[in-house]
Interface confidence: low
């Protein structure tokens, strides 16, 4: 678990994109809108983050939909399919 | 697998240059985002400079405009031009791949910088 910090001044990140590869898993975690990240999901796999970053996504992710993903996002997961446990699947709604 | 060996480095006075390689064995080299680490004597290992698959590039705040991260994937060889270097360059350089697809735990022997003032 990401231990939750303020974001620094100037880091918060506007879009999803490759600068992200090189924040800090805080950095992620304080400066990345979970809601931001879920409409942008598309933009996930096409960027070299590492496993420890991804799992710092899908926490984020996981606070957004506490009772799972909506298919918006399921449809978008990529890499961050890797990340996700029996009870994490068990909770879509999938049609 | 893609097995990487890092080259290049040297000792160099403060405001010189260096030019490291890393030469890597896959045949899907190219597909793959690289890029290149440094871990200094006591300090955790940081990515100083990616580049995709397509050739974006993405650079650490401490090396913008010092640092140029390039690969020729015909030689399936990823390049980092060290320009105007400081003293907290020194560090060991290693390269290596920035996807999920690949495990992102086996590391080469890195390649020594050494920065005097």
């Known amino acids: 678990e990401v231990e939750k910090t303020a974001c620094p001044s100037g880091k918060k990140a506007p879009e999803i994109d490759e600068s992200l590869i090189f924040y800090k898993k805080w950095e992620l975690e304080a400066c990345v809108d979970a809601a931001l990240l879920a409409t942008q999901m598309d933009r996930v796999n096409a960027i070299p983050f590492t496993y420890e970053q991804l799992d710092v996504l899908k926490h984020k992710l996981d606070e957004l939909y506490p009772q799972g993903y909506p298919e918006s996002v399921i449809q978008h997961l990529g890499y961050l399919f890797l990340k996700m446990s029996p009870e994490d699947i068990r909770k879509w709604n999938v049609t | 697998e893609v097995q990487l060996v890092e080259s290049g480095g040297g000792l160099v006075q403060a405001g010189g240059s260096l030019r490291l390689s890393c030469a890597a064995s896959?045949?899907?080299?190219?597909?793959?985002?690289m890029g290149w680490y440094r871990q200094a004597p006591g300090k955790q290992r940081e990515l100083v400079a990616a580049?995709?698959?397509?050739?974006?590039?993405n650079y650490a705040d401490s090396v913008k405009g010092r640092f140029t991260i390039s690969r020729d994937n015909a030689k399936n060889t990823v390049y980092l031009q060290m320009n105007s270097l400081k003293p907290e360059d020194t560090a060991v350089y290693y390269c290596?791949?920035?996807?999920?697809?690949?495990?992102?735990?086996?590391w080469g022997q890195g390649t020594q910088v050494t920065v005097s003032s």
């Open positions: 580049i995709s698959s397509g050739g974006s590039t």
């Open positions: 290596n791949t920035r996807s999920p697809r690949v495990p992102n735990d086996s």
């Open positions: 896959g045949s899907t080299f190219s597909s793959y985002p």
